[in-house]
Structure formats: C-alpha cells, structure tokens
Interface confidence: low
Amino acid sequence: ESALITQQDLAPQQRAAPQQKRSSPSEGLCPPGHHISEDGRDCISCKYGQDYSTHWNDLLFCLRCTRCDSGEVELSPCTTTRNTVCQCEEGTFREEDSPEMCRKCRTGCPRGMVKVGDCTPWSDIECVHKESGTKHSGEVPAVEETVTSSPGTPASPCSLSG
C-alpha cells in the first residue's frame, strides 16, 4: 500500500481526519479515489474531474484537481485516482528551478556553438561549443547568430502538479 498523504500535502481546508475517525472499512483508511466520511464509518468516492486521492488515506476531503495554466496543455485529465498532468506547450519548457511557469525555448545557439538537443517540454535546446564539446544551456548572451530549430516532440510530462 502507498504511503499516507501527509498533512503538508493538503490545502488548508483539506485537513486530515483526527485519529478517532480511523474506523473505515480497511484498517481505518480509504482506497485511492475516495476519502473518509465525517463519522469515519464509510469511504466516499471523489468527484471525477473535480477532486482525487492517489493513496490509501484518511482525508476528510479529496484533493482538488489541478487546472492547467495558459501556456500548458492537458496531457491527461484528472481522474478520481490521479491528478491532472499538465505539460508546457510546444516551444516552451519548465525548468526545475522555476517550475511555476513555462519559459520560451531559445530559437538557436550563440555564435561558436552548435545545437545538440531539441526544445522539449522539460528542457531548453542544448548547445555545445564547436571546439570543446562543452554543453551550454539556460540564459545566454544576446544571440548574434542563430541556428533555427524545431520544437521536440513531447514524450513525457514536465509537471505532475498536486
């Protein structure tokens, strides 16, 4: 069985059930896709497209589904057991150090560098120095000479919100 969803994972209004509520059908926990009833006796299903729970839990409320931001595409919808999977639109990517927004991929590499990696929803284009082969990505000085690139094909989600 999966680990319990912890208090920190919950929005303020989604408080975990107090200990005395742990008397639902399966060792005090409800299965994924459900939350515990207020009297702790029953498991209540989450509402498709509105909320979800991914683990065995004693939540009084299911977790609210993420809505994809503008600039993101919905890779898979929210179900009762899985949150929405959002992905950056073609030509944009999400960096690990700034996961809150999708950033535009560069259109080409600076002078003296060649492109070795396409723009993907989770990475900018990759450039290496022609001579040394040293990789370079992230912020660069103003591009003086560009090599046109086409966005890569999305292969996996760059964000699994929730």
Partner: antibody
Framework: EVQLQQSGPELVKPGASVKISCKAS?????????LNWVKQSHGKSLEWIGY????????SYNQKFKGKTTLTVDKSSSTAYMEFRSLTSEDSAVYYC????????????WGTGTTVTVSS | DVLMTQTPLSLPVSLGDQASISCRSS???????????LDWYLQKPGQSPKLLIY???NRFSGVPDRFSGSGSGTDFTLKISRVVAEDLGVYYC?????????FGAGTKLELK
Amino acid sequence: EVQLQQSGPELVKPGASVKISCKASGYTFTDYYYLNWVKQSHGKSLEWIGYIYPNNGDTSYNQKFKGKTTLTVDKSSSTAYMEFRSLTSEDSAVYYCTRGSNWIWYFDVWGTGTTVTVSS
Amino acid sequence: DVLMTQTPLSLPVSLGDQASISCRSSQSIVHSNGDTYLDWYLQKPGQSPKLLIYKVSNRFSGVPDRFSGSGSGTDFTLKISRVVAEDLGVYYCFRGSHIPPTFGAGTKLELK
C-alpha cells in the same frame, strides 16, 4: 456496443479455488471506469464484492470478501478476473462483473453472469 | 455498513396500474459534494440487472419516461406510471459513493 462477456459455469469442490473471467469490449478498457464484481446468491439480493481500476490496478474490497477473493486484470486482452479461494457452499451463486463510471457510482453495463456451484 | 430497506418485498399489480416502491437508508447518503448517489436497477427473470435511474431521479439512456425516481436524505421512491408486461421483475435500490456500495433486498413486481 459495450459488452462484458463472462466465462461459463463452474462446478467446484469445497475447499477448491475458482477463477472466473470478464472480457470487456466496445470501449477502452483502461478509460475511467471501475470493473466491479457483484454476487447474487440463489433467490437473494445483490452484494458488491469489490472493484478493480484497470487503468492502474487499484482494488477495493468489501470487508466481507477480503482475503477470500483476488481481483486482477490483463490489460492486453481487456479482461478482468476474480479468483475465489477456499470455496464453501455459501459461495454458490451467480457472479456478475459490472462497469462502474468512477465519477458517478452507477453500474451502467452488466456482464452475462457466471454460475458457480460448490458441491462435493 | 449502511442498510437499504425496500418496501414492499412483493408488489402484485395489474397491467396499466401505477406502482410505487420505497427505499429507506439507515443514514443519510448525501455525498459531501451535495449529490445523492441512489440508483434503481431492474432484474428480469433469467437476466442480468439493468440500470434504470441514477442519482435519485435521472433516467438512464433508453429507459421509458413511465419510470421516475424521487426522494432525498434517507427516503427514496421509484414510481412506474403505467405498468406494462416488460416491467415485471425484481427492482433493487442501490446506494453508491460509499464503500461498500449496498443494494436493497429487492421488490418483486408481479401480476395479481
């Protein structure tokens, strides 16, 4: 047309196990539906046994049947299975698989039913 | 578990009659989202059950409008305005959204 085709009748001895199948067709098996199993003893009402969520294999069981049954799926053949262990005469019944929409808890499609008879 | 009590267990009718079946839950079955997951199924002799009504009053596709569901909280009713031969069988109420989902004992609709 959405259909749930179940395996044929079973005659088994007390203490034995039985595994019955339910083949789904007419819809995407791994879409957002639960595959439930329901027991109907002769001339009696219906009892929910449990469900399996084909998309990720999640299961939930009625406490009464926990440890007695195991629900599995084979995604490649769009088939759900229910295995019953340590059978007694109390397990003689018709077993239905049913499709349940996971955002509205109704069973919109029912299987053909599998009769299990436990007798020595 | 929540107990679903159906009355009557047997309902003799003449064709063309109105029929009414009651289902009472041992506790409120209103979901925390405000919906009430109370469904009705009909099982004809030798057949699998079929869904008639979901969420108290919504007719499932293909179900004739002579079937109607009503109720709230703990008390629910299925009405058939004019019984025809194909309506004969056993009617079950069903409480969804809580684990374990529970069926009523059934009401047998039969000819007088």
